[in-house]
């Protein structure tokens, strides 16, 4: 039975040209995290594997940095980066947990963080 919960940074916004940290946290389970995949609408951004460490997708080598923790830092943001991002936690023995973050990249100099929310 999957008892865990993914907490994410929720809906967030950031300035064009700036950077943003995408964060997910898995709680309420003792399952072992074997791998975390970060995706943007079905495209792989990065993998953090328990044994192999961080690996960044070739399309994003120059704009994505690993961490902090199991999170991901997106740099040199463009308006095209607006959209849904998913953290996919592969765990043993529970299986897969998925968290969703929506990022809006703004042209203006005003960019506020949204509230945190949970996905069971």
């Amino acid at each position: 039975m999957m008892t865990g919960t993914i907490e994410t940074t929720g809906n967030i916004s950031a300035e064009k040209g700036g950077s943003i940290i995408l964060q997910c946290h898995l709680s309420s389970t003792t399952a072992q995290v074997t791998q975390v995949n970060w995706e943007q609408q079905d495209q792989l951004l990065a993998i953090c594997n328990a044994d192999l460490g961080w690996h960044i997708s070739p399309s994003f080598k120059d704009r994505v940095a690993p961490g902090p923790g199991l999170g991901l830092t997106l740099q040199s943001l463009t308006v095209n980066d607006t959209g849904e991002y998913f953290c996919i936690y592969h765990t043993y023995p529970d299986g897969t947990y998925t968290g969703r973050i929506f990022l809006e990249v703004l042209e203006s100099s005003v960019a506020e963080h949204g509230a945190r929310f949970q996905i069971p």
Partner: antibody
């Protein structure tokens, strides 16, 4: 040793779908130490990468922008093979098509590698 | 896309002499996180698929004769055949695997003078 064996028709009519298959022996299409690619070669375009499929706890695809609206690369785990479908072909799609394994060195880069194993190539002509 | 440009387009070298092929990428293929150059070299003979010779810019693939060597970093790379043999007559390609789409050079044809 790892081998890739291509199959599929050598002649396709314009506007129809080009379909090729690449059978893998000595490795698994679900390997987490490889990606499975399609590349084509023509006198006018040289060697042109079309796309790849790979498994890293789930399946992913990457496609070249030039063909993204027309291409599908699918793994078939039951037959240990992967396929290329290219829709709405034109004579400009005439080329030798190759499948290739992208071998990754996981402790350096788990998502990028050089093409260490190639299929024999299939000459595909698009003509009515 | 990263554009790969090779020079020369063709090269005629006497048997036993050195052959040098250059490859330039439109942007760096050196990844600072692992200090690796994402550059490969291939040999293609007529009617055959390309064959991997060199990866990570300078690592020889298993079974490749040691007369083949690769060097360079960042944007400028070289494939050297130290002593050309008759069986080395082929077209040679560089390829970057730093950023998708993977891209190849236009090829350099090596012939015997």
């Amino acid at each position: 040793q790892v081998q890739l064996q291509q199959s599929g028709p050598g002649l396709v009519k314009p506007s129809q779908t080009l379909s090729l298959t690449c059978a893998i022996s000595g490795d698994s299409v679900s390997s987490n130490s490889a990606a499975w690619n399609w590349i084509r070669q023509s006198p006018s375009r040289g060697l042109e990468w079309l796309g790849r499929t790979y498994y890293r706890s789930k399946w992913y695809n990457d496609y070249a922008v030039s063909v993204k609206s027309r291409i599908t690369i699918n793994p078939d785990t039951s037959k240990n093979q992967f396929s290329l479908q290219l829709n709405s072909v034109t004579p400009e799609d005439t080329a030798v098509y190759y499948c290739a394994r992208e071998g990754v060195l996981r402790y350096f880069d788990w998502l990028s590698g050089a093409f260490d194993i190639w299929g024999q190539g299939t000459m595909v002509t698009v003509s009515s | 896309d990263i554009v790969m440009t090779q020079s020369p387009d063709s090269l005629a070298v006497s048997l036993g002499e050195r052959a040098t092929i250059n490859c330039k990428s439109s942007q760096s293929v050196l990844y600072s996180s692992n200090n690796k150059n994402y550059l490969a070299w291939y040999q293609q003979k007529p009617g055959q698929p390309p064959k991997l010779l060199i990866y990570w810019a300078s690592t020889r693939e298993s079974g490749v004769p040691d007369r083949f060597s690769g060097s360079g970093s960042g944007t400028d790379f070289t494939l050297t055949i130290s002593s050309l043999q008759a069986e080395d007559v082929a077209v040679y390609y560089c390829q970057q695997y730093y950023s998708t789409p993977w891209t190849f050079g236009q090829g350099t044809k090596v012939e015997i003078k």
